[in-house]
């Protein structure tokens, strides 16, 4: 978790002077109480939009937007903290809008944004807003928190920023696998326009089950030049196994950009559809 | 100009099954989350499920836990809502709605619903 690190953070607006401070994610005001404290956050709002740095890459970043109650509590707000917890890691990241000047009651209703977080694709978040000071311990909570989830590489905005095109999200291999005699899979993709090597990886299982049954690797060489994005064809050879009939066929690049962590591509045949009505059985049996 | 068109509303018996389709258009449908609302006959507006730009990601209202399935296709811009195990208090009018930004968020939206169709009634009664 990071900020994005271009132009100076701004919380100020007309009627408020206000300063964005990095947090420890520990306000003094759970140590010390206080006796009056504002109430919670309205209107929690959470989209996911881009930002570009100072060096022109495009990032994927939370966009924060809050308003304030109409009570008399905004005589008590001091600022706010902005937390992003990463729920898989826990790793935490928090700043604080330090108000330099008192509220007051105007004819709009306070908004507050901040679109600074930087977010990681397909990675899920919980984003809280607390307001300052943080309440006594029995007293109300002020604060509003929302579970935001970022989509992945395969979204069609997505693919197009650096952590995504860093791993590969612009490559379309366009897999086609096709079941030969002889039990072989013929796998056929598009090579991307980097001399990097791939990776196929075939995972078997029976009809209706979930493990595999047959499960092999093939390394395919780094292409030529000339070779960019045309097609590789790739004859695998499978066990003969009754009922190992449903495959998936992996891809996974070597990227410089990416090396052993590139988006993979995967493709699957499904088993052969059974005849609805059983084999007939004969009248007769014979008897030699 | 964006559009959503809600169908297969109508009058079941309790314990029966609906499935409600929504059919979007005017905008880029895999891009976004969307929701189903229902508005409740003397009551307000509840949320009832969402789902992900891709359908990877579901959430519910508690009161449809385990009886409503949501679902999309992208290929042919609709959202799906498979409703069984019916009861009375489900009688409401459903609508299918937009997210306004990018982005999925347990327990309702992120943000606004900034596009509402026009509602289909479910009537659920014996």
């Known amino acids: 978790l990071r900020l994005l690190d271009h132009r100076a953070l701004v919380c100020s607006q007309p009627g408020l002077n206000c300063t964005v401070k990095n947090s420890t994610c520990l306000d003094d005001s759970w140590i010390h109480p206080r006796n009056l404290t504002p109430s919670s956050p309205k209107d929690l709002q959470i989209q996911l939009h881009f930002a570009h740095t100072q060096q022109g890459d495009l990032f994927p970043v939370a966009h924060i937007e809050w308003t304030l109650q109409t009570d008399a509590s905004i005589l008590y707000l001091e600022g706010a903290e902005l937390s992003v917890l990463q729920l898989n890691t826990n790793e935490r990241l928090c700043v604080r809008f330090e108000f330099l000047s008192k509220l007051r009651h105007h004819h709009r209703r306070w908004r507050f944004t901040f679109s600074h977080f930087v977010v990681d694709p397909d990675q899920e978040y919980e984003v809280t807003v607390h307001h300052l000071p943080k309440p006594i311990p029995d007293g109300d909570p002020n604060h509003q928190s929302k579970n935001f989830l970022v989509p992945d590489c395969e979204h069609a905005r997505m693919k197009v920023t650096t952590p995504c095109m860093s791993s590969g999200s612009l490559w379309d291999p366009n897999i086609t696998v096709e079941t030969l005699e002889a039990h072989q899979l013929r796998v056929s993709f598009t090579l991307w326009n980097e001399s990097t090597h791939y990776q196929i990886l075939l995972t078997s299982f029976p009809h209706m089950e979930n493990h595999s049954c047959f499960e092999h690797m093939h390394h395919i060489p780094a292409p030529r030049p000339e070779e960019f994005h045309q097609r590789s064809n790739v004859t695998l050879t499978l066990r003969n196994l009754k009922g190992c009939c449903r495959h998936q066929v992996q891809i996974q690049p070597f990227f410089s950009s990416c090396l052993n962590d590139c988006l993979r591509h995967s493709a699957t045949v499904s088993c052969p559809e059974m005849p609805d009505t059983p084999e007939p059985i004969p009248d007769y049996m014979p008897l030699w | 100009e964006v559009q959503l068109v809600e169908s297969g509303g109508g009058l079941v018996q309790p314990g029966g099954s609906l499935r409600l389709s929504c059919a979007a258009s005017?905008?880029?449908?895999?891009?976004?989350?969307m929701h189903w609302v229902r508005r409740v006959p003397g009551k307000g507006l509840e949320w009832v499920s969402g789902?992900?730009?891709?359908?990877?990601?579901?959430d519910y209202a508690d009161s449809v836990k385990a009886r409503f399935i949501i679902s999309r296709d992208n290929a042919k811009d609709s959202l799906y809502l498979q409703m069984n195990s019916l009861r009375a208090e489900d009688t409401a009018l459903y609508y299918c709605?937009?997210?306004?930004?990018?982005?999925?968020?347990?327990?309702?939206?992120?943000?606004?619903?900034?596009?509402w169709g026009q509602g289909t009634l479910v009537t659920v009664s014996s």
């Open positions: 709605v937009k997210e306004e930004g990018l982005g999925f968020c347990r327990g309702g939206s992120c943000s606004t619903f900034d596009f």
């Open positions: 789902i992900s730009w891709n359908g990877g990601s579901l």
């Open positions: 005017g905008f880029t449908f895999d891009d976004y989350a």
